[in-house]
């Protein structure tokens, strides 16, 4: 229904705490360089205004759209042009163009320092002094670095953060209580960020239909006992929620997500037998829980898929009658039978089925043409299964760090023009798939591996879009989202690449490396590895292993030496010489 004042409506629905959190996230995602204090001031002004509208919906400006209200706030910031350059031009536009302009200026890779966690004592002190400000800082810092982070989910992670601090700051050994728990939240939040970015990419590049297809497949896997009408309703609602969040309409998004969670909990009987535990939780936990609820048990008596989609005489008539509905039912029926497939694979199969019907239904004898379609799915299914087996075997053999290095070599050979920091970030993220997925039961590996890889590769594409340097990457990123991962997997050594000349300084290290945390040490070594491959793209695995082992030995020796500086300055040049010889 229409409300006289949209801002009053959302404030009432969400409550002050969530309202303020969401407005802070929205501002931080739009203007990523502003300080927390600048944004906190704007949030307070917006909240005070919302309260006046709650008191009197007819008050001045209360009838304005949220985009107008928020956009006016952002555009009133002093020194906008000095700090944000051409983003200030957005303020010359009218809504809805102004909001579109803000969205286009979101930066997926802002030049902000990494979000450093303070040490435990300091963290607990500032948390105890002012928990609200502390959590505000968390929302601001995450949101500005991840401008498409799913806002209601970020509120959930902030709540987790809050609970961990409340518990651990009361402990004697705060550090050992906080570190593993906060690391866990950070890891989950980073995965959530790349997954949501993928959803927004799908929406932005291919529209709502593409996202809805993703949602139908995913929901059908999770709720195989729900009928097609129920799945369609959930997919439509989920598409609306994601469209709003991706579009910067965070208050509407969070409100609609809460509504969807409420609907699911009120209709468990027609959706799934696994929802009760989630539905007993408070709002943020409930919605999070529902988003990753375990798959319901598949109905035992499902007929073979061929009956309705190959053997039925009416296939082409049903397809002609309502293409999207017929393809939707195919995707639903196939997905509910295959919780062991990735959503990407299911969408590729649906696309293959659609292409087959397009071709065959135009022929004089369609059944003879589409009769073999299910057999033609086989290679499409085998390819990701082989990928999972090969990569999980390699991960089990090498461990996470070694597996990341193997991926780094592979991807540097595929796209040596890409900047080394981007290659290292991508390889480290891709390499985490082993730890994340390869330890799962067999039937959960494929969906875990492929859907995670697809999300990471989406980030590679977004970063590459900013500064396109590799034709290989451009080719894979230009196609449909579901074809990206197979495209990247199929890439081989880029034969057009002219190797980088060997620069000794790239491989010169100093004693400061010894005091770096293990993660930073790994990044330094991986940076050197990528540079080696750029110098010798056709180096064998054996040659690279020899050099990297030598390098590790050199670091180990010099970091244990009494006079580290002397060791680095004398042994370093010898290492460089040996590297050159080994790769000659």
């Amino acid at each position: 229904e229409a409300h006289k004042s949209e801002i009053a409506h959302r404030y009432n629905d969400l409550g002050e705490q969530h309202f303020k959190g969401l407005v802070l996230i929205a501002f931080s995602q739009y203007l990523q360089k502003c300080s927390y204090d600048e944004h906190a001031k704007l949030v307070q002004e917006v909240t005070d205004f919302a309260k006046t509208c709650v008191a009197d919906e007819s008050a001045a400006n209360c009838d304005k759209s949220l985009h107008t209200l928020f956009g006016d706030k952002l555009c009133a910031i002093p020194n906008l042009r000095e700090n944000y350059g051409e983003l200030a031009d957005c303020c010359t536009k009218q809504e809805p163009e102004r909001n579109e302009c803000f969205l286009q200026h979101k930066d997926d890779n802002p030049s902000l320092p990494p979000f450093e966690r303070p040490e435990a004592e300091a963290m607990c002190t500032s948390f105890k002094e002012n928990p609200t400000t502390f959590m505000g800082h968390y929302l601001h810092e995450v949101a500005r670095r991840h401008p498409y982070f799913y806002a209601p989910e970020l509120l959930y992670y902030a709540e987790q953060y809050n609970e961990i601090l409340t518990q651990c700051c009361a402990e004697a050994d705060k550090e050992s209580c906080l570190t593993p728990k906060l690391d866990g939240v950070k890891e989950k939040a980073l995965v959530s960020s790349v997954r949501q970015r993928m959803k927004c990419s799908s929406m932005q590049k291919f529209g709502e239909r593409a996202f809805k297809a993703w949602a139908v497949a995913r929901l059908s896997q999770t709720f195989p006992n729900a009928d097609f009408a129920e799945i369609t309703k959930l997919a439509t609602d989920l598409t609306k929620v994601n469209k709003e969040c991706c579009h910067g309409d965070l208050l509407e998004c969070a409100d609609d997500r809460a509504e969807l969670a409420k609907y699911m909990c009120e209709n468990q009987a027609t959706i799934s037998s696994k929802l009760q535990t989630c539905c007993d939780k408070p709002l943020l936990k409930k919605a999070h829980c529902l988003s990753e609820v375990e798959h319901d048990t598949m109905p035992a008596d499902l007929p073979a898929i061929a009956a309705d989609f190959v053997e039925d005489q009416e296939v082409c008539k049903n397809y002609a009658e309502a293409k999207d509905v017929f393809l939707g039912t195919f995707l639903y029926e196939y997905s509910r039978r295959h919780p062991d497939y990735s959503v990407s694979l299911l969408l590729r199969l649906a696309k293959k089925y659609e292409a087959t019907l397009e071709k065959c239904c135009a022929e004089a004898n369609p059944p003879a043409c589409y009769g073999t379609v299910l057999a033609e799915f086989q290679p499409l299914v085998e390819e990701p299964k082989n990928l999972v087996k090969t990569n999980c075997d390699l991960y089990e053999k090498l461990g996470e760090y070694g597996f990341q290095n193997a991926i780094l070599v592979r991807y540097t050979q595929k796209a040596p023009q890409v900047s080394t920091p981007t290659l290292v970030e991508a390889a480290r993220n891709l390499g985490r798939v082993g730890t994340k997925c390869c330890t799962l039961p067999e039937d959960q590996r494929l969906p875990c591996v492929e859907d995670y890889l697809s999300a990471i590769l989406n980030r590679v594409c977004l970063l590459h879009e900013k500064t396109p340097v590799s034709e290989h990457v451009t080719k894979c990123c230009s196609g449909s989202l579901v074809e990206r991962r197979p495209c990247f997997s199929a890439l081989t050594v880029d034969e057009t690449y002219v190797p980088k000349e060997f620069k000794a300084e790239t491989f010169t290290f100093h004693s400061d490396i010894c005091t770096l945390p293990e993660k930073e040490k790994q990044i330094k070594k991986q940076t050197a590895l990528a540079e080696l491959v750029k110098h010798k793209p056709k180096a064998t695995a054996e040659q690279l292993k020899t050099v990297m082992d030598d390098f590790a030995q050199f670091l180990d020796t010099c970091c244990k030496a009494a006079d580290k500086d002397t060791c680095f300055s004398t042994e370093g040049p010898n290492l460089v010489t040996r590297c050159k010889d080994a790769l000659a």
Partner: nanobody, 115 residues
Framework: KVQLVESGGGLVQPGNSLRLSCAAS????????MSWVRQAPGKGLEWVSS????????LYADSVRGRFTISRDNSKNTLYLQMNSLRAEDTAVYYC????????SSQGTLVTVSS
């Protein structure tokens, strides 16, 4: 909504000709192969002829090959069946269908061949 409306049936003497039409709506006609099927009194449905979406490929049942010609006009969303040298055994209700369907979902048009 897909709609198929057949017309052109009637009573003819053996050896004569008839031309059946099928007006299609509610779908992209040119993207779909079309067929004619028939049902003789007290019998099941029998496939007669099919044509590809572009009209270049045609198929016929042995019982009508050489006598019947299937064609289409995509600009008019219409399917045709030219029936020459009609025989008593061609008496049936004729239906047009989408793709290779052997299921009638329209009214059909009755062809009676009798002297």
């Amino acid at each position: 909504k897909v709609q198929l409306v057949e017309s052109g049936g009637g009573l003819v003497q053996p050896g004569n000709s008839l031309r059946l039409s099928c007006a299609a709506s509610g779908f992209t006609f040119s993207s779909f192969g079309m067929s004619w099927v028939r049902q003789a009194p007290g019998k099941g449905l029998e496939w007669v002829s099919s044509i590809s979406g572009g009209g270049s490929d045609t198929l016929y049942a042995d019982s009508v090959r050489g006598r019947f010609t299937i064609s289409r006009d995509n600009s008019k969303n219409t399917l045709y069946l030219q029936m020459n040298s009609l025989r008593a055994e061609d008496t049936a209700v004729y239906y047009c269908t989408i793709g290779g369907s052997l299921r009638a979902s329209s009214q059909g048009t009755l062809v009676t061949v009798s002297s």
